[in-house]
């Protein structure tokens, strides 16, 4: 567990021409506050939600009414830090977004409009319990300072806040103040208590009883903001001026880079590492391109058609935002049909299908017969990716569900009389007529109107010949029909098994990516 | 003016190995994903393989046709990615461009190489 | 894998004429489809980007249209510096995939 830190020293027009002179609007005075959205910085093939690891809102800023003919200060800021809490682990690695709303506080039906003024993302590596790191950033033709920290709150320690340290109940090694940090029996830790009176906000400390001021801050207590004019060239939080860091014999003594860049020492020289968006050997260039890389996650980035964006980001699937750097759940959109399963690996959608269905988007109702649909003896007939069933005699409905009565439709022809029979319906027929159906007249001299009888058939016996015939042709027709159900069905589920092992197999390998 | 300059191709037999470089100027390479794509004499363009960042801690993705064989590395420090390619095909002979990006915008000038014995 | 079909393999043409090639895709790719320009002896050139966007520097007479599965790359009066081999690519679903390419020659 710790805390986030995000302190705003000054947002402002950027240099150069066409700088706005106001963040309000023509229908009056306005104010600012600052949104801040933390996101782990992991491969972007790990799905998280937005501001995963936190956000925060700052205070509202002080009314700022724009004074005709005046260049655009500094503009007036709310107080205090920005502390986003987080519960676990530090990630070391987080993208960083920062936002600059506008409260335009003129006659707003429903109350004060409030847009979004400046967006800037910066994506960094930082440990935890590290000094503060301070940055600039350009959001088209404004320019926002800050410095950000990541602190572990006690009993949490190290770099990821991840190693706890516990009183423990044996007698410990450790002197007086400190104590043990477990697992680790012989490390002895103490919280850093800073000299007293230290600024929370420009000062922090490494080693007990010591006050380090913030970049831009000076004094035994980090109260006194350092002249930007003759010093560091930075605008600071107040425009005072009483104080001055004064370079030492050390190269990097008060901070030849400028723009927020780091110094370090060389042999008798010193190197600045810049910010993005600022280059030269003191980071004194600046302006962001596209051959910085600002789009995050493979952004194509083209130069902006117009001033005030210096670029825009064509993102990936999968991304947006200004700097592309804002995830979308693609599966929110159900892209999956027929109850497929949507799973987002970051640089693909894949569908799980439900059985019974394929294709991309689980579009294709594989379903025909596949899944023994038709009931009651049924059989399946196929068709353009669709299957209907033709039902057994005394069943109907789309699946062969309903019962139905055989003789309803009264089948028998010439008066002949109807019984339901498990396999159908037989037909009693009057005298005179024979048949399954009762449809052939028996001529009086005993000749049939049918082609000649099978041997072993008695023409004067017709209701016996007839129920004879529908036994027959209905326990053929039932053997078939089984033997071509459990056929289809054996190479149905053959080819839709294949599927499923070269499906499982793709998607291993897509997540192992 | 961005350059991405590939050199390393050349000439190998079936099985062997060849690590192609590729060094970029002109561009904060570090904030970079870096490709690999290649083209088969006079056939088309396949993607090979790509690297991410160091926030993305290094992850690579590879073509179905190379995996298990070819490995992409990056030194920002030097402004190069690698592309390390073992136990090679005669099919693996083609020309090997580096892009950056997702969606390929600089190319550099490629390297060749051919796989015959 | 994404497929991407493009189509004619070859033309011919002269200066003036407008010339279009298109490229379908084997399933629904959005518009996340760019066009590449290739001269010989040279690497590959980004044309356009998310199926109709212009990248910087490329002149008017080059544009891009559809979506879904049906794209279209534009010449619209063919100049001498256009006799290229053209390719179309898809990025909607890893890994990018890239059509065989048309080759537009002088008539």
């Known amino acids: 567990a710790g805390v986030f830190e995000l302190q705003i020293h000054s947002f402002g027009p950027g240099p150069g021409p066409g700088a706005p002179r106001s963040p309000c609007s023509a229908r009056g005075p306005c104010r600012l506050f600052f949104r801040v959205c933390l996101k782990p910085g992991l491969s972007e093939e790990a799905a998280e939600s937005p501001c995963a690891l936190g956000a925060a809102l700052s205070a509202r800023g002080p009314v700022y009414t724009e004074q005709p003919e005046a260049p655009a200060p500094d503009l007036p800021l709310p107080n205090g830090l920005l502390q986003v809490p987080f519960r676990d682990a530090w990630p070391g690695t987080f993208s960083l977004i920062i936002e600059t709303w506008r409260e335009e506080l003129g006659d707003q039906i429903g109350g004060p409009a409030w847009s979004l003024l400046a967006r800037v993302t910066r994506r960094r590596r930082l440990a935890a319990g590290g000094p503060w790191a301070r940055d600039i950033q350009r959001a088209g033709a404004w320019e926002l300072r800050f410095s950000y920290r990541a602190r572990c709150e006690l009993p949490a320690v190290g770099t990821a806040c991840t190693r706890l340290c516990r009183p423990r109940s044996a007698p410990s090694r450790c002197g007086p103040g400190l104590r043990p940090c477990a697992p680790l029996e012989d490390e002895c830790e103490a919280p850093p208590v800073c000299r007293a009176g230290c600024s929370l906000e420009h000062g922090f400390c490494e080693q007990p009883g010591e006050c380090r001021c913030l970049e831009g801050w000076t004094g035994p207590l980090c109260m006194v903001p350092v002249s930007t004019s003759s010093c560091l060239g930075l605008r600071g939080p107040s425009s005072t001026t009483t104080g001055c860091l004064v370079p030492g014999p050390g190269p990097c003594d008060g901070n030849p880079c400028a723009n927020g860049g780091s110094c370090s020492e060389t042999p008798g020289s010193f190197e600045c590492t810049c910010p993005r968006g600022f280059y030269g050997l003191r980071c004194e260039v600046s302006g962001v391109t596209c051959a910085d890389g600002p789009c995050f996650n493979g952004g194509l980035c083209v130069g902006g058609a117009d001033p005030d964006s210096a670029y825009i980001c064509h993102c990936p699937p999968g991304f947006q935002g200004s700097n592309c750097e804002k995830r979308v759940d693609r599966c929110s959109l159900q892209p999956c049909r027929n109850g497929g399963l949507c799973l987002d690996l970051g640089h693909a959608l894949r569908c799980r299908c439900r059985a019974g269905f394929a294709g991309p988007r689980c579009e294709h109702d594989l379903d025909d017969c596949a899944g023994r649909a038709c009931a009651n003896g049924g059989t399946c007939v196929e068709g353009g990716g669709a299957h209907r069933c033709s039902c057994a005699l005394g069943f109907g409905g789309r699946n062969c569900r309903e019962r139905a009565d055989p003789c309803a439709a009264r089948p028998c022809a010439h008066g002949g009389r109807c019984y339901a029979h498990f396999s159908g319906l037989v037909c009693a027929c009057a005298p005179g007529y024979m048949g399954a159906r009762c449809e052939f007249p028996v001529h009086p001299d005993g000749v049939s109107a049918l082609p000649a009888a099978p041997p072993g058939l008695r023409p004067g016996d017709p209701q016996r010949a007839g129920v004879i015939a529908v036994i027959v042709v209905v326990v053929i027709a039932i053997v078939a029909g089984i033997v071509v159900l459990v056929i289809s069905r054996k190479k149905r589920m053959a080819k839709y098994e294949k599927a499923e092992i070269k499906e499982m197999g793709e998607m291993h390998r897509e997540l192992n990516a | 003016e961005v350059q991405l300059v590939e050199s390393g191709g050349g000439l190998v037999k079936p099985g062997g190995s060849l690590r192609l470089s590729c060094v970029a100027s002109?561009?904060?390479?570090?904030?970079?994903?870096m490709n690999w794509v290649r083209q088969a004499p006079g056939k088309g363009l396949e993607w090979v393989g790509q690297?991410?960042?160091?926030?993305?801690?290094?992850?690579?993705h590879y073509a179905e046709s190379v995996k298990g064989r070819f490995t992409i590395s990056r030194e920002d420090s030097k402004n190069t990615v690698y592309l390390q390619m073992n136990s090679l095909k005669t099919e693996d002979t083609a020309v090997y461009y580096c892009?950056?990006?997702?969606?390929?915008?600089?190319w550099g000038q490629g390297t060749t190489v051919t796989v015959s014995s | 894998n994404i497929q991407m079909t493009q189509s004619p393999s070859s033309l011919s043409a002269s200066v003036g004429d407008r010339v279009t090639i298109t490229c379908k895709a084997s399933?629904?790719?959005?518009?996340?489809v760019s066009w590449y320009q290739q001269k010989p002896g040279k690497s590959p050139k980004l044309l356009i980007y998310?199926?109709?966007n212009r990248y910087t520097g490329v002149p008017s007479r080059f544009s891009g249209s559809g979506s879904g599965t049906d794209f279209t790359l534009t010449i619209s009066s063919l100049q001498p510096e256009d006799f290229a081999t053209y390719y179309c690519?898809?990025?909607?679903?890893?890994?990018?995939?890239f059509g065989g390419g048309t080759k537009v020659e002088i008539k």
């Open positions: 892009t950056t990006g997702y969606y390929f915008d600089y």
């Open positions: 002109g561009i904060t390479f570090s904030n970079f994903w």
């Open positions: 690297i991410r960042l160091k926030s993305d801690d290094y992850a690579t």
């Open positions: 399933e629904n790719v959005g518009t996340y």
């Open positions: 998310g199926a109709s």
């Open positions: 690519g898809q990025f909607y679903s890893f890994p990018s995939t």
